[in-house]
Interface confidence: medium
């Protein structure tokens, strides 16, 4: 709330609390305030102040306890390396400004691990990974000295320990003590020193959280050998007889606020979607809490592994549910998780020791009642027999991730709760709920899933091509004949699927321009592959001027596409990717996919059209039930088809039909939409079922789409289920896993 519009309900005056170069906002109904500075600046000497019972704001004290009269926004600096072992870094400076670079160099006989060059980022952190100069002489590799920390201990033999410290006023995140373990890995996780103004950027959180989560979800055999000194990646076998429980724990206390609560729910919906995209089906537990916890989904419920059902339960939770009891009792919430984990009569069921448990806690800060929640984490570790047997510590069977949101987060508390694992991060502090939402959108979109088909970045900051990342624009330049515009869809790293009629046999590759991702540059074409049965003049003798059967073509690109948020493939029918996208069992057949995507009824679908330089989705219905016949018969109104006796002469079984006014008035395609995908949107994924081919009525005569169109304005699309053998043959090297 802007301070001018909100007066604290407590008795603290707002006089003189301003910050030079920034602003402030009130929190907790005026009982606290947060200083806000522009990007690249931080509030000095404190970020938050509390309204004391005496009616005054907490004093402005520096890290060395000096009192300051007025708060100010100061430029963010990155910490300097206190120490760097076995090498040098340049340049040396007492502090570094945003965008300053440093480089690391090892002495002879030492090899550099991590990032040789690092840049000071706008959040006060260095880019890249800790630079370490190591000669491989220890049993464990040198654990390094993260910039800003000090390390005590330089022996790396089995069971040797090193400890880390931060300068005064900074909080240590990660492990203060790390021990060299059997197998050559270090216990715990790399530490870092955090200032109160430091937040993790959404990109950092998405990358770190996902790389840790995928370690948990997508593991390979844990028995892989590794020699001493090797960096050991955590590897977990997804034992078919084992399982995974994910407990989502959401703070619903007063200080969170209704909009933040809704934002957190969105994040968790995205997380469930993400996990489902990996093809695993964990059981979910769902807890919200304030003074008391409320269990919405128990892992023992039959539907707890049904991602759609869990998402539905999550969406139905109301912030008001905790309104009357709005403290923050994190301990009780974790006890609710413990109760879900424990066994009736304390008798462990068969396979209990193969179940992995992931706790994801989202909170805006301080537990203010119920005692220290860390004791419950210890009880959970005991229950799961974690950390008891040195030979088999079972650390892989529990992951506790903590997301702290906002300025009031107590970094020490959240760090204590989170798991600490080598090369992984389990504790995150983000600026606000908007940033956390960014995390989960980015997470859905991280590089490991870039090859996942039919995924989009449905985000408020998304561009047209974030929302339609498969969409390709095609134009064919014909000297003295102007140019033809079409659409297409990225189906793999080398291929774009479009309509054959966009091209003539005379078109040369260099005259075909293809662009994707909204990029200005055109892609180089290697070849255009037509369906062998396509022949536009095939029925001229029969008085049919243009015949569009098998109107499909694949454009093969010279260079591999680099997938990203604005360039990624759409799903094709009868591929493994589509099986996963639809969350169908791996044994699903092509026929079963067809029944799922094209049942005998009106099917809600969409196509993408460009209007006034913007891509827009147009919702249509594929007439595949009782309206199919009448839809197809309207083809007789198409120019040149009026003399066709039997409409099946032009509307072959290869076509899908949309348009008309029933069940709803469908928008129609325009000439420039040809070749674009006809899409079914299911389970947050996009599957192409057709290629836009031809229309009965030109509804876009004067570059403008007509509003009033006749009921017989129908569009015809090549049904991809009907051209699968050709697709399978041409795309056989594209790793799409055709069924």
């Amino acid at each position: 709330t802007p301070w001018s519009l909100a007066r604290p309900q407590g008795s603290c005056s707002l006089e003189g609390v301003e910050i030079k170069g920034g602003s402030f906002r009130l929190l907790q109904e005026g009982q606290a305030l947060e200083y806000v500075c522009p990007s690249g600046f931080y509030p000095y000497p404190v970020q938050t102040r509390t309204c004391r019972s005496t009616g005054s704001w907490s004093t402005l004290k520096t890290q060395d306890q000096k009192t300051v009269r007025k708060a100010e926004c100061r430029a963010i600096h990155c910490p300097r390396p206190h120490d760097f072992e076995n090498g040098e870094y340049w340049p040396r400076s007492p502090y570094y400004n945003v965008s300053d670079e440093i480089s690391f160099h090892c002495y002879d006989g030492y090899t550099l691990r991590g990032s040789a060059n690092r840049t000071c980022q706008v959040n006060g952190r260095w880019s890249g990974q800790t630079a370490i100069c190591d000669n491989g002489a220890g049993y464990c590799s040198n654990p390094g000295i993260p910039i800003g920390t000090r390390k005590v201990g330089s022996q790396y033999r089995l069971e040797d320990s090193v400890t880390y410290h931060c300068s005064r006023g900074l909080t240590l995140r990660g492990s203060q003590r790390r021990t060299c373990q059997e197998g050559g890995s270090w216990s715990g996780t790399e530490p870092s020193c955090q200032d109160s103004f430091m937040y993790d950027t959404p990109q950092e959180v998405a990358e770190a959280f996902l790389s840790s989560l995928t370690e948990t979800i997508e593991g390979v055999d844990a028995e892989d050998g590794h020699g001493p000194g090797e960096q050991q990646k955590r590897k977990i076998v997804l034992d078919p007889s084992g399982s995974m429980n994910i407990y989502l724990v959401l703070d619903g206390s007063d200080s969170i606020g209704a909009s933040n609560f809704t934002g957190a729910k969105k994040c968790l919906v995205n997380l469930i979607e993400k996990v489902a995209s990996y093809g695993v089906k964990p059981r979910y537990g769902l807890v919200t809490y304030a003074t008391y916890p409320k269990i919405w989904v128990k892992v023992s419920e039959a539907d707890s592994s049904n991602a759609d059902w869990v998402t539905k339960q999550l969406n139905e939770i109301n912030y008001e549910d905790h309104k009357l009891k709005s403290g923050t009792n994190t301990k009780k919430a974790l006890q609710a998780v413990y109760s879900m984990m424990s066994w009736p009569d304390d008798v462990p069921p068969e396979g209990w020791n193969r179940t992995r448990h992931v706790i994801i806690l989202m909170t805006d800060g301080l537990h203010n009642m119920g005692g220290d929640p860390i004791t419950v984490i210890d009880e959970i570790r005991d229950l799961l027999y974690i950390g008891k047997d040195r030979k088999n510590p079972r650390e892989d069977y529990l992951d506790v991730y903590v997301f702290g949101v906002g300025p009031l987060v107590n970094q020490v508390n959240i760090n204590a709760l989170a798991s600490k694992k080598d090369n992984e991060q389990h504790v995150f502090k983000v600026k606000d709920m908007e940033n956390l939402e960014d995390v989960f959108y980015q997470m859905i979109d991280e590089s490991q899933s870039l090859s996942l088909c039919g995924m989009v970045w449905e985000h408020r900051k998304g561009t047209d091509y974030h929302k339609q990342p498969w969409q390709a624009k095609i134009s064919v330049i014909r000297p003295s004949k102007g140019h033809e515009s079409c659409m297409g869809a990225v189906v793999s790293e080398y291929f774009v699927l479009t309509a054959a009629h966009c091209f003539t046999v005379d078109d040369k590759e260099h005259s075909i321009k293809v662009s994707v991702g909204g990029e200005k540059r055109d892609l180089e074409i290697e070849v255009v592959l037509f369906h062998p049965n396509y022949n536009i003049n095939g029925k001229k003798e029969a008085g049919i001027p243009e015949f569009y059967d098998y109107d499909v073509a694949l454009i093969k690109l010279k260079n591999k596409l680099k997938y990203g948020q604005t360039i990624r493939p759409i799903c094709l029918p009868c591929t493994e990717g589509t099986t996963r996208a639809l969350r169908l069992p791996p044994t699903t057949t092509c026929q079963q996919q067809k029944e799922e995507l094209l049942p005998a009824q009106d099917i809600k679908a969409l196509f993408v059209s460009e209007e006034e330089k913007k891509l827009t989705r147009k919702e249509v219905y594929i007439k595949n039930g009782d309206k199919k016949g009448s839809c197809e018969r309207d083809a007789q109104y198409a120019p040149g088809y009026d003399k066709v006796k039997d409409i099946s002469e032009v509307v072959t079984p290869r076509f899908l039909c949309t348009g008309g006014v029933s069940p709803y008035a469908d928008p129609n395609t325009c000439r420039g939409d040809s070749g674009g995908p006809l899409i079914v949107h299911k389970r947050s994924r996009f599957i192409q079922v057709g290629v836009i081919s031809w229309g009965v009525v030109d509804v876009c005569k004067n570059q403008k789409r007509q509003k009033q169109v006749p009921a017989h304005a129908r569009d015809f699309h090549i049904n991809l289920f009907q051209v699968l053998p050709w697709l399978k043959e041409k795309l056989q090297d594209e790793d799409l896993g055709f069924l």
Partner: antibody
């Protein structure tokens, strides 16, 4: 062998700008920072700043901030130093120099120098 | 900024004699964790660019005759030429790289007596 060859002498009027080039050969241009140092007649050496030819990132001495611009053209392995709003006390020999590794501060290789004279 | 002060400003020494040039920094150039001093010495002859002689305060650059040596630690450093040769006539500069901006001493002019 490593060679840094600078552009020829320049005479400029006060208020004008000068752009000195430094062409590198005998090593991978983008692997080493290029530093610029100047020396007024009969005076000592003064560090002006550097450019990372790989990223284009620069670091300038506070004294020259706002007046100096360091750029590079990796296609021809050449670094440039442009100094604007010239004053008579900018009359100096300008050197480019390269360290041992990355952005090492020990300048083992130097250009021959470019004399810039600022005079009305 | 770290200020580097050399003494003397100029020095005349007979051929074959020892020459000693001092350099004092306004703050310590010693990095305790590596026990290294961030100081270099350069030689500059008329009409030529400077030439690196010594780095890390005492490490001789390859190809530099062993009559040149560097010593000192913290804030006080010395460049010694054990037996002056005619080709050693030049201006000598110390330079700190402990902190940005990197700064040079004002130079010491060495001549033959």
């Amino acid at each position: 062998q490593v060679q840094l060859v600078q552009s020829g002498a320049e005479v400029k009027k006060p208020g004008a700008s000068v752009k000195v080039s430094c062409k590198a050969s005998g090593y991978s241009f983008t692997d080493y920072y290029m530093t610029w140092v100047r020396q007024a007649p009969g005076q000592g050496l003064e560090w002006m700043g550097w450019i990372n030819p790989n990223s284009g990132g620069t670091k300038y001495a506070q004294k020259f901030q706002g007046r100096v611009t360091m750029t590079r053209d990796t296609s021809i392995s050449t670094a440039y130093m442009e100094l604007s709003r010239l004053r008579s006390d900018d009359t100096a020999v300008y050197y480019c120099a390269r360290g041992y590794y990355a952005n090492s501060a020990w300048f083992a290789y130097w250009g021959q120098g470019t004399l810039v004279t600022v005079s009305s | 900024d770290i200020v580097m002060t050399q003494s003397p400003d100029s020095l005349a020494v007979s051929l074959g004699e020892r020459a000693t040039i001092n350099c004092k920094s306004s703050q310590s150039l010693l990095q305790s964790s590596t026990s290294k001093n961030y100081l270099a010495w350069y030689q500059q002859k008329p009409g030529q660019p400077p030439k690196l002689l010594i780095y890390w305060a005492s490490t001789r650059e390859s190809g530099v005759p062993d009559r040149f040596s560097g010593s000192g630690s913290g804030t006080d450093f010395t460049l010694t030429i054990s037996s002056l040769q005619a080709e050693d006539v030049a201006v000598y500069y110390c330079k700190q790289v402990y902190n940005l901006p990197w700064t040079f001493g004002q130079g010491t002019k060495l001549e033959i007596k």
